[in-house]
């Protein structure tokens, strides 16, 4: 019969991570329904009474929203009809971490899925040649990390080598007393080699590569969120 609520619809979430102090997205998709007014989206958080966000009859309904989320959430309203129930979260905080449920009801039926939301800080590293040092050195810097990450160096020429004895890593607390600046210096580097600085915590892994030759310096950076669906 296709009566609302009698059938289950597929709802899919993706584990994601939020960078504190920035916008975050809690991803959720469902079987599309062209009848926008018949779609209800509810976001809930484990341990929180009230809703994180509710969207129904084509608009937001904040009447049951928990105070910690007031003014911080929005769905992508123009994408709801195509099955996007993802939630935009403003100014991600450490306390936003936890288990969220994306609950959907449409004219086709209803369904829900959970997602684990991790929060922390992560940023791209930048590697530069440290000309101030007594010997040829590389300096790897990343401005914001939390929790404290591990830092490791690797080289294309000396694959598998342990650089812990010839590197020095420091963590400097940023002014807001939560995140830290990561600085790692690698000593005694050789020319015509590619070095990688890898920074990793349980949320993200970032790598900065630098290739130093007689004529040029080439850099590349990448950041990958861990356990992302």
């Amino acid at each position: 019969f296709g009566i609302s609520g009698k059938h289950f619809i597929t709802v899919t979430t993706f584990t994601s991570a939020g960078n504190i102090g920035e916008d975050g997205t809690l991803s959720c998709t469902f079987e599309p329904d062209i009848k926008l007014n018949g779609i209800v989206i509810q976001w809930l958080k484990e341990g929180i009474k009230g809703l994180v966000h509710e969207f129904k009859e084509g608009k937001d309904d904040l009447s049951q929203q928990h105070e910690m989320f007031r003014g911080r959430t929005a769905v992508f309203a123009d994408q709801v009809v195509v099955g996007n129930a993802s939630l935009r979260l403003k100014n991600v905080q450490l306390t936003d971490a936890g288990t969220y449920t994306c609950y959907i009801r449409t004219s086709k039926g209803k369904g829900n899925a959970n997602l684990e939301y991790k929060t922390g800080a992560f940023s791209m590293p930048e590697i530069n040649v440290d000309y101030n040092a007594s010997s040829e050195s590389l300096r790897c810097e990343a401005p914001r990390w939390f929790p404290q990450p591990t830092v490791a160096w690797a080289s294309q020429v000396d694959q598998g080598a342990n650089f812990s004895e010839v590197s020095n890593t420091s963590f400097e607390l940023n002014s807001e007393n939560v995140t830290m600046k990561v600085v790692s210096v690698l000593y005694n580097v050789t020319i015509n080699n590619t070095y990688s600085c890898m920074i990793e915590n349980d949320i993200a892994k970032a790598t900065g590569d630098i290739k130093v030759t007689d004529s040029e310096v080439k850099r590349r950076s990448q950041l990958q969120l861990l356990n992302s669906g």
């Epitope: 102090g21 608009k59 937001d60 003014g71 959430t73 403003k90 002014s175």
Partner: antibody, heavy 121, light 107 residues
């Protein structure tokens, strides 16, 4: 396009109250927060507070609690700010502005033309 | 409450030149900083939000950057119509906060 039309200038007596309006058009009034700011010459802007017309939820700058009252009328798509117990310090231009981002409180993206309030006996 | 300290309070620059204005937050950290242009008798105009995102229709001569507590706003290739007061807004927290404003004069 988004437009916010504010009520006209007012000359009011100390100790009285004034209620100014901000009529919105060009967007869904109930879906966006509306913020209010005060501007005095040589003092820059001060944040007063904001209201979500879709539910009447408000946030106030502690400094203006008890002084300002924010309300909204969904039927006329109009936001109001009442200022009470007026003193010369309340003489200023008051602006309303829509906060970008729908239910998410974003930056003030569209502003009214301002309402000038002069408090004088 | 967060305070936004803006500097300088006024500056004069030459046509075609470049200026930079800064805002420093008293505490906290987030990317929710916007920059506005305000001319006498007009309502403020949003130029940049989320630290560096240009509003539609705003020329690329205007730019913003920053992180942590320090944010900056620049205008390059200055034009006569850039004469105005510019101010920042921190909108990341429950209580929004404005910078004191910078009056820019073009010579």
């Amino acid at each position: 396009q988004v437009q916010l039309q504010q009520s006209g200038a007012e000359l009011v007596r100390p100790g009285t109250s004034v209620k100014m309006s901000c009529k919105a058009s060009g967007y869904t009034f109930t879906s966006y927060w509306i913020g209010w700011a005060k501007q005095r010459p040589g003092h820059g802007f001060e944040w007063i507070g904001d209201i979500y017309p879709g539910g009447g939820y408000t946030n106030y700058n502690e400094k203006f609690k008890g002084k300002a009252t924010l309300t909204a009328d969904k039927s006329s798509s109009t936001a109001y700010m009442q200022f009470s117990s007026l003193t010369s310090e309340d003489s200023a231009i008051y602006y309303c502005a829509r906060l970008d981002g729908s239910s998410y409180r974003g930056a003030m993206d569209s502003w009214g033309q301002g309402t000038s309030i002069t408090v004088s006996s | 409450d967060i305070q936004m300290t803006q500097s300088p309070s006024s500056l004069s620059a030459s046509l075609g030149g470049k200026v930079t204005i800064t805002c420093k937050a008293s505490q906290g950290f987030n990317k929710y900083v916007a920059w506005y242009q305000h001319k006498p008798g007009q309502c403020p105009r949003l130029l940049i939000h989320y630290t560096s995102t240009l509003q539609p229709g705003i020329p690329a001569r205007f730019s913003g950057s920053g992180s942590g507590r320090d944010y900056s706003f620049s205008i390059s290739n200055l034009e006569p119509e850039d004469s105005a007061t510019y101010f920042c807004l921190q909108y990341g927290n429950l209580l929004y906060a404005f910078g004191g404003g910078t009056k820019l004069e073009i010579k």
